[in-house]
């Protein structure tokens, strides 16, 4: 469910949303590190109805979210990272 | 005291529609995501929808999907079930339910239920 | 789709004494399981939620535990009040429930 992604593209997100919403509705998470041509973190949430939102990363439970899935990943599996270069 | 009152329940033949409401109270609706739930004629508990609480996001399971549209009116306190294209297998007992709160960020689940609104589908 | 397999469906137990249920997930759901007592005529309660976090209001007599994919959820002290329909549901990945357990006064 968590993914990062490095991207040398602009920002994704226009606009960020710090709706909360619970992890049985979320498909996947997408988070872009700042830097290259991005002054800012981004995540994207894919939900389970299809739509995709970008979350302000500084909103207390997606902080809350990731802390948990770094947790357990490192405790079992590792985290899927895709790393994407554009030149 | 928080209350769920559902209504419009009924004998609608199969292909025919139905809209049930659900009248909230002793608590701030707009504050809370909120679902359907049914209970077939084998006791058994199935979810149907559930809309965010303010009302941009549902979300359905693939059988009820495409039938059945989940809405609300936080000025009025009431949540909606459209349900459409009704099937033998949709006859239940329908349930409302609140679900989490929209400003938290806690897992909880469904926490208060109605006393539920009867559906038959037949010929 | 995640399938919640309860145990046993039906029981019966004298007064004062205790009852476990069981309900296993076909995948791990991450201790997001919750329990519902269902009488005839009303809603379901919500006993417990994320495993073993009683709501409020709920005797301690009821409780539960469990990881991964199995959990279980115990009522000891039987009190004639108890005597219902009990459900789990996993809110991990959307919802299912599992497929009840009645339990009745011996």
């Known amino acids: 469910v968590l993914e990062v992604y490095y991207t040398s593209l602009r920002c994704r997100c226009v606009q960020e949303s710090s709706v909360f919403i619970p992890r049985r509705f979320i498909d996947r998470i997408q988070i872009l590190p700042r830097g290259n041509g991005c002054p800012r973190k981004e995540i994207i949430v894919w939900k389970k109805n299809k739509s995709i939102v970008c979350v302000d990363p500084q909103a207390e439970w997606i902080q809350r979210m990731m802390e948990v899935l770094r947790k357990r990943s490192s405790s079992t599996l590792p985290v899927p990272v895709f790393k994407r270069k554009i030149p | 005291e928080v209350q769920l009152v559902e209504s419009g329940g009924g004998l609608v033949k199969p292909g025919g529609s139905l809209k049930l409401s659900c009248a909230a109270s002793g608590f701030t609706f707009s504050s809370y995501a909120m679902s359907w739930v049914r209970q077939t004629p084998e006791k058994r508990l199935e979810w149907v929808a559930t809309i965010s609480d303010g009302g941009s996001d549902a979300y359905y399971p693939d059988n009820v999907k495409g039938r059945f549209t989940i809405s609300r009116d936080n000025a009025k306190n009431n949540l909606y079930l459209q349900m459409s294209h009704l099937k033998s297998e949709d006859t239940a007992m329908y349930y409302c339910?609140?679900?989490?709160?929209?400003?938290?960020?806690?897992?909880?689940?469904?926490?208060?239920w109605g006393q539920g609104t009867s559906v038959t589908v037949s010929s | 789709d995640i399938q919640m397999t309860q145990s046993p469906s039906s029981l019966s137990a004298s007064l004062g004494g205790k009852v476990t249920i069981t309900c296993k997930a076909s995948?791990?759901?991450?201790?997001?399981i919750a329990w519902y007592q269902h009488k005839p005529g009303k809603g379901p309660r919500l006993l417990i939620h994320y495993t073993s976090t009683l709501q409020p209001g709920i005797p301690s007599r009821f409780s539960g535990s469990g990881s991964g994919r199995d959990y279980s959820f115990s009522i000891s002290n039987l009190e004639p009040e108890d005597f219902a329909t009990y459900y789990c549901?996993?809110?991990?990945?959307?919802?299912?429930f599992g497929g009840g357990t009645k339990l009745e006064i011996k």
């Open positions: 549901l996993q809110y991990d990945n959307l919802y299912t």
């Open positions: 339910a609140r679900d989490y709160y929209g400003s938290g960020y806690e897992d909880s689940p469904m926490d208060y």
């Open positions: 995948q791990d759901i991450n201790k997001y």
